[in-house]
Amino acid sequence: MKVLQEPTCVSDYMSISTCEWKMGGPTNCSAELRLLYQLVFQSSETHTCVPENNGGVGCVCHLLMDDVVSMDNYTLDLWAGQQLLWKGSFKPSEHVKPRAPGNLTVHTNVSDTVLLTWSNPYPPDNYLYNDLTYAVNIWNENDLADSRIHNVTYLKPTLRIPASTLKSGISYRARVRAWAQHYNTTWSEWSPSTKWYNSYREPFEQR
């Protein structure tokens, strides 16, 4: 049994880190493999993660960590029974992938404006709470070429767009993702999308 693509890990900088890797052939990840992880300091406790399959040769493991802090560094050991397949280390604060924003809502009752709001995925006591910026993707359900990205570089999780910039009588969808500036993180996953109908009509004299 061989590792084809070594584990790569990302952390939500709270309590969960996710590691993914590929095996040399079809593998029942949960039955055949274990990923052991241990905080690098004195004789810290060793934890075990049971991986799940992620495609035919892919495995994924969700490592539960006790409140990740900047100093933490973990050793990772991938085992197949008594055989050590791979050994590595992982510093969560250097490989941050933020949690996805949630509760994306579209408010169309404000005349001439579409207001999108969403929730910051972090609590205020987490550093990332005040470090996130967002990208909002809006697209026409009937014409995927009619798609745009709005970068939200201010802290407030809201976006206002003039309804006139969207086609009238069309259903649109939106989704949002986040990244943290200071940590130069990867982008989060996209939030679930939300749908609305753009019923805006130009005033008669502008037609």
């Epitope: 409140d67 802090v69 100093m71 006591d125 550093y127």
Partner: antibody, heavy 121, light 107 residues
Framework: QVQLQESGGGLVQPGGSLRLSCAAS????????LTWVRQAPGKGLEWVST????????LYADSVKDRFTISRDNAKNTLYLLMNSLKPEDTAVYYC??????????????WGQGTTVTVSS | DIQMTQSPSSLSASLGDRVTITCQAS??????LAWYQQKPGQAPKLLIY???RLQTGVPSRFSGSGSGTSFTLTISGLETEDLATYYC?????????FGQGTKVELK
Amino acid sequence: QVQLQESGGGLVQPGGSLRLSCAASGFTFSSYSLTWVRQAPGKGLEWVSTIKARGGTTLYADSVKDRFTISRDNAKNTLYLLMNSLKPEDTAVYYCAKPLYNNFAGDFGSWGQGTTVTVSS
Amino acid sequence: DIQMTQSPSSLSASLGDRVTITCQASQSISSYLAWYQQKPGQAPKLLIYGGSRLQTGVPSRFSGSGSGTSFTLTISGLETEDLATYYCLQDYSWPLTFGQGTKVELK
């Protein structure tokens, strides 16, 4: 505002024990890692121990490992340091400290006023 | 363990002077460095975190710079209330380690 109040210091003989307490208020106690830092007379600051927010991870300086035990009671908003087998070199002012953010465990934005521990025969 | 070496261990300066204190790490700590001020009989006070971020309420005459292994705390114009001992702290890896301190006195 955040308040940290240490207590439990005093004079103790070598080999003796003490339990320090740090009563906290003004923040969500259970969300933060908390730390003890000490300062021997006329000396610099020394990290002693940290306990993570949920209490499952405790970390110690080599100089106190196996003698000191850090713990917390999230229901009582109190941090503890049980010090056994005390040595004269443990004589210091002991501070409890809270970080600015729960994932920046070393950036201590709040400190107690300190409690003095003297180990002497 | 990461060793933090501060220099100088003490310095004398006049009011209004620009004061610079350096902290050297024995290995790279990225930007995980904080600066503290301590006055006699008082608890330390956080000035700078993340290498260069000014803690709320700290006067803007204090600034921090550097990354990797070399860091600097600068006081752009020394005032009476700045006479104190300054410590750096690395929070890049366990165990947390402080510099030995720099005492700033009046010339």
